[in-house]
């Protein structure tokens, strides 16, 4: 069965910067990946980024720099201020689209205990929801 | 074939605002994002921002986040964009354009651009 | 924002000779997924709009004559026009089409001896 892994981290030297990473563990050909915060996409989640494998990268303030890492894996780094800017508890959900399996996501947090610089390594979370 | 439509030129006065249009016609106005792009004279083109026209969600570049409104009237498949508290900075073209069919950003069909010259 | 820097800024060529004109950007356009480079050139005629030449560094826009070729890859990218014609008279500008925001180069004009 596909996961797919989110990891987040705030950087120790900007606490209003967060980087985000995602992970795809699945066989199949990835078609889009939509990286949100405050929620699932498509519920109450709001679109930071979307990476197209061959179309290029639509991101959205606070989104600074979202690239893919490898072809089943990419990071976004966040630096906000104000309103715009992610907190601690903020949930960040990465969901991707892949052929033949569909789409899988997942969300993660900056785990509790974090100091910034920190942050868990990048496991499995829990799948939120497969189309 | 693809067509833009722009007005040719507007004269305004500084803090007021103005709404330029872009009339598309040529191929399904909801099938692409609509992108405007700002040139002052001498100057290089700097891109404003993006909208959708399947469902208006909009992208700005963040330095005109607060001096420029995107919307679209899918009725006549138009485009247009609001500027306001103008100065004279804001002299310039101000063209439309639609994105590749392949790619975000490449844009391969624009307008002939609306001259906007701030002056009182 | 990526930066994209062009040069020369202008040049003046005879009719029939080979032009290159550069462009560097502050970060790579190299997809690494399709490895294509996410890089565009634009032809702008005096009291013209912009008209796109060529996009993914090389692939040059349908009706655009094949004089025109875009080469490069990476932070490092070149317009070579084969034979110049009177026509071409133009500022080029370069632009990274790989992210938000798409930013342009400042442009190169070029000047028909």
């Known amino acids: 069965t596909p996961e797919v892994w989110v990891q987040v981290r705030m950087e120790a030297t900007e606490l209003s910067s967060f980087t985000i990473r995602c992970g795809f563990l699945g066989s199949g050909s990835i078609s889009l990946v939509t990286v949100s915060w405050g929620g699932p996409n498509g519920a109450g989640g709001t679109t930071l980024a979307v990476l197209h494998p061959e179309r290029g990268i639509r991101q959205w303030a606070p989104a600074r720099q979202a690239r893919w890492e490898t072809q089943s894996s990419i990071s976004l780094i966040l630096e906000g201020s104000g309103a715009s800017s992610p907190c601690a508890n903020t949930t960040f959900c990465c969901k991707f689209a892949s052929f033949p399996e569909g789409s899988w996501e997942a969300c993660g947090s900056l785990p509790p205990s974090s100091d910034p610089g920190l942050s868990a390594p990048p496991t499995p979370a829990p799948i939120l929801r497969a189309d | 074939q693809v067509q833009l439509q722009q007005p040719g030129a507007e004269l305004v006065k500084p803090g007021a605002s103005v709404k330029l249009s872009c009339k598309a016609s040529g191929y399904s106005f909801p099938s692409y994002w609509m992108h405007w792009v700002r040139q002052r004279p001498g100057q290089d083109l700097e891109w404003i921002g993006e909208?959708?026209?399947?469902?208006?969600?909009?992208n700005y570049n963040e330095q005109f986040r607060n001096k420029a409104t995107l919307t679209v009237d899918k009725s006549s498949s138009t485009a247009y964009m609001q500027l306001s508290s103008l100065t004279s900075e804001d002299s310039a073209v101000y063209y439309c354009?639609?994105?590749?069919?392949?790619?975000?950003?490449?844009?391969?069909?624009w307008g002939q651009g609306t001259s906007i010259t701030v002056s009182s | 924002d990526i930066v994209m820097t062009q040069s020369p800024s202008s040049l003046a060529m005879s009719v029939g000779q080979k032009v290159t004109m550069s462009c560097k950007s502050s970060q790579s356009l190299l997809n690494s997924i399709n490895q294509k480079n996410f890089l565009a050139w634009y032809q702008q005629r005096p009291g013209q709009s912009p008209k796109l030449l060529v996009y993914?560094?090389?692939t040059r826009e349908s009706g655009v004559p094949d004089r025109f070729i875009g080469s490069g890859s990476g932070t490092d990218f070149t317009l070579t026009i084969s034979s110049v014609q009177a026509e071409d008279l133009a500022d080029y500008f370069c632009?990274?089409?790989?992210?938000?925001?798409?930013?342009f180069g400042g442009g190169t004009k070029l000047e028909i001896k």
């Open positions: 354009a639609r994105h590749h069919g392949s790619t975000y950003y490449a844009l391969d069909s």
């Open positions: 909208i959708n026209p399947s469902n208006g969600l909009t």
């Open positions: 632009q990274q089409h790989y992210s938000t925001p798409p930013t």
């Open positions: 993914f560094a090389s």
